[in-house]
Amino acid sequence: ARILRAPESHNVTFGSFVTLHCTATGIPVPTITWIENGNAVSSGSIQESVKDRVIDSRLQLFITKPGLYTCIATNKHGEKFSTAKAAATISIAEWSKPQKDNKGYCAQYRGEVCNAVLAKDALVFLNTSYADPEEAQELLVHTAWNELKVVSPVCRPAAEALLCNHIFQECSPGVVPTPIPICREYCLAVKELFCAKEWLVMEEKTHRGLYRSEMHLLSVPECSKLPSMHWDPTACARL
């Protein structure tokens, strides 16, 4: 067995997807296995194609830690094995997401509408793009809350939780206070499971321009734009 194309080393940021390629040839056509830090690859997807006695293997990885990845091409002539190896390193670049200067601050929730939904001591993000953030955000919830009076008993508690956690996002304190978005999965559960009918009606009304103010639109998150808990368990807030 002979390796024609060795996998290349990469220096990537945490949470990146990387595809390692390994191409080998031989008679008979070799098999390719991948080794991660000396062990069989535990995660990632492998795709293979064979053409004209050349095997091409692609290992796609979701990078959460550095590692040494080895491609091993093996074939057998009678009783003799022939093996070729090639390795690549995946290193994680210094992770420095530039700090956004979020316009706001962290404070304990002192309103009424979301009292039963938000954790008692939790810090929420108050957006200083409003003149009076607490009042403005409370009014946003209140307006949307009134519309929930007509929804089903199954939908209502889920929608209330989503609204409160979306408008009063959990706040990570620090030099730059940072709002933590809701996990996509929770948003989708409300949209597709608990409130499927209601969500459709609301989207329909939105498209037809039946909502007079943009206030209501602000109170409904776009699930697809939210981070997934599978990308990084700490990247979003769980309801």
């Epitope: 945490f14 949470g15 210094e94 992770w95 420095s96 997401k97 530039p98 700090q99 200067d101 962290c106 954790a119 008692k120 001591d121 939790a122 810090l123 990570s172 304190p173 620090g174 030099v175 730059v176 940072t178 709002p179 933590i180 981070p227 990084d232 700490t234 990247a235 979003c236």
Partner: antibody, heavy 124, light 107 residues
Framework: EVQLVESGGGLVKPGGSLRLSCAAS????????MNWVRQAPGKGLEWVSS????????YYTDSVKGRFTISRDNAKNSLYLQMNSLSAEDTAVYYC?????????????????WGQGTLVTVSS | DIQMTQSPSTLSASVGDRVTITCRAS??????LAWYQQKPGKAPKLLIY???SLESGVPSRFSGSGSGTEFTLTISSLQPDDFATYYC?????????FGQGTKVEIK
């Protein structure tokens, strides 16, 4: 390798002034908030001041408000602490400390890298 | 300001011992708490943040737990390198405050 090196400490009389500097290397200085933390001889740690990456957010502990000014020059990879109206209570080792956010980008990680400190002595 | 109180102030232990240090906050800080280790003449070193998240490169014998007002730092099996002073720090709200420190000394 991340390095923070403080300088500018020394002996100063009560009422006097001093400017501390912290030279940063080994990381993208302009992407990080920076802090000053002090420790009086034989005592515990006390947070003094913080400044965000673009200087939009600045905070001080009550005892230094109006006397100390934190600033930074991202082009020079430097953090500063201008200390005026010094008193004996300000005698301490002053540490420059970096902070960061964890990999998610949301959760704050305080004081993950520290300098070796510079001693400020206020005495007549 | 939020007051942080550590106990005990001094702790005598032997290599291999399980050591627990407690930190109490005067009001709830949810999980916004960090732990540091400091050796004489050296700068502090971050061990734990967000009450229980282990900082990269810190040995797994260190662990943090707790939420609200009561927190603990545990060293599962004390090593010679662990004799030092430990500080907790809240970063729930400014002013950020530290505990007074716990000195872990050789018995």
């Amino acid at each position: 390798e991340v390095q923070l090196v403080e300088s500018g400490g020394g002996l100063v009389k009560p009422g006097g002034s001093l400017r501390l500097s912290c030279a940063a290397s080994g990381f993208t200085f302009s992407s990080y908030s920076m802090n000053w933390v002090r420790q009086a001889p034989g005592k515990g740690l006390e947070w003094v001041s913080s400044i965000s990456s673009s200087s939009s957010y600045i905070y001080y502990t009550d005892s230094v408000k109006g006397r100390f000014t934190i600033s930074r020059d991202n082009a020079k990879n430097s953090l500063y602490l201008q200390m005026n109206s010094l008193s004996a209570e300000d005698t301490a080792v002053y540490y420059c400390a970096r902070d960061r956010y964890d990999r998610s980008g949301y959760y704050y990680v305080p004081f993950d890298q520290w300098g070796q400190g510079t001693l400020v002595t206020v005495s007549s | 300001d939020i007051q942080m109180t550590q106990s005990p102030s001094t702790l005598s232990a032997s290599v291999g011992d399980r050591v627990t240090i407690t930190c109490r906050a005067s009001q709830s800080i949810t999980s916004w708490l960090a732990w540091y280790q400091q050796k004489p003449g050296k700068a502090p070193k971050l061990l734990i943040y967000k009450a229980s998240s282990l900082e990269s490169g810190v040995p797994s014998r260190f662990s943090g737990s707790g939420s609200g007002t009561e927190f603990t730092l545990t060293i599962s099996s004390l090593q010679p390198d662990d004799f030092a002073t430990y500080y907790c720090q809240q970063y729930n709200s400014f002013s950020w405050t530290f505990g007074q420190g716990t000195k872990v000394e050789i018995k």
